[in-house]
């Protein structure tokens, strides 16, 4: 008799999930000497322990604490780049500007980037068929709770000037419901963070509007100012040129506005 299995609205666990997490961990510890002490088997066991045999709509931040402890990592607190709805460019940027870090440049962010996972209540099985969707099923699912937890910790660690890359092509350049808008903004520590600097990335070639005047950016400025953190905003009109100038700052064309 086939066992009844809960059908969720979201895609199931990424295939070869355990192997992928282990492989990423090994690769990360090889590349980052400061994380060589990390035992990847312990990391996997802690990761698995956060969601296996638990109802995938009843996951808490507490479930991830053993993993958080093992993945504790010190990044330069004044070199943090947050992003919202523009992950690829943010990652391209930190690949060139090696002294800056997105969440996915840390061990825990790197392990989970672009992966989906969930288990089933009372069985040790990983569910490869379906996992809860944040909107259609529940918000306290393994993936959402993981990103909420690591994002909160990342924002809490930030200091001095914090940068955030925002997608100027979206109808809501700043979205209060994004991880940045709902978690990171509210966990920046005013006693440590002096300024949040937004980089609004333009999509269109001929788009010369000042997107820093967008109502949603003004909303972000208001939220940040109320938290006693200064706010500044820059338009990045030409993201391709922006990246090129990060790679080659001496280039003569890099003195003009990008």
């Amino acid at each position: 008799v086939p066992r009844w299995r809960q059908q969720w609205s979201g895609p199931g666990t990424t295939k070869r999930f355990p192997e992928t997490v282990l492989a990423r961990c090994v690769k990360y510890t090889e590349i980052h000497p400061e994380m060589r002490h990390v035992d990847c088997q312990s990391v996997w066991d802690a990761f698995k322990g956060a969601f296996i045999s638990k109802h995938p709509c009843n996951i808490t931040e507490e479930d991830y604490q053993p993993l958080m402890k093992l993945g504790t990592q010190t990044v330069p607190c004044n070199k943090i780049l947050l992003w919202s709805r523009i992950k690829d460019l943010a990652h391209q940027f930190t690949q060139v500007q090696r002294d800056m870090f997105t969440l996915e440049d840390t061990l825990l962010g790197y392990l989970a980037d672009d992966l989906t996972w969930c288990g089933e209540f009372n069985t040790s099985k990983i569910n490869y068929q379906s996992c809860p969707d944040w909107r259609k099923d529940c918000s306290n699912n393994p993936v959402s709770v993981f990103w909420k937890t690591v994002s909160r910790r990342f924002a809490e660690a930030a200091c001095d000037v914090v940068h955030v890359m925002l997608n100027g092509s979206r109808s809501k350049i700043f979205d209060k419901n994004s991880t940045f808008g709902s978690v990171e903004v509210h966990n920046l520590q005013p006693e440590k963070v002096q300024t949040l600097e937004a980089w609004v990335i333009h999509g269109g070639r001929e788009d010369s509007r000042d997107l820093c005047q967008d109502p949603t950016i003004k909303e972000l400025e208001s939220i940040i100012s109320k938290r006693n953190i200064q706010f500044s905003c820059k338009n990045i009109y030409r993201p391709d040129k922006f990246l090129q100038c990060v790679k080659n700052p001496e280039d003569s064309s890099c003195t003009s506005e990008i």
């Epitope: 282990l22 510890t29 990847c40 088997q41 312990s42 698995k48």
Partner: nanobody, 122 residues
Framework: EVQLLESGGGLVQPGGSLRVSCAAS????????MSWVRQAPGKGLERLSA????????YYADSVKGRFTISRNNSNNTLYLQMNSLRAEDTAVYYC???????????????RGQGTLVTVSS
Amino acid sequence: EVQLLESGGGLVQPGGSLRVSCAASGFTFSSYAMSWVRQAPGKGLERLSAISGSGVNTYYADSVKGRFTISRNNSNNTLYLQMNSLRAEDTAVYYCASGKGWDGNTWYEDYRGQGTLVTVSS
């Protein structure tokens, strides 16, 4: 280039002990889990034991639990298998392997050595 070189095999009497070693090179040894597998004459591969990168986690098959001990020295890139209370059925070629780790009984292997022969006979 990854190299795994086993040594220490030989002839031992039933009830005796032996320690086999595996010298590793060509990769960041401490980042990788390591394991021992064996192949008895005419039989398939049997995973015996595994150890995590730092050595804090170990795995043993039921057939060797309590008799065999896996260990590693990350400062000289060497893996060990201490075998006690040896039996005739432990006769096999013993291979060391590097990998990403394990999940339950699934071992994620990357490379395997050439093996060393252990013969248990009176």
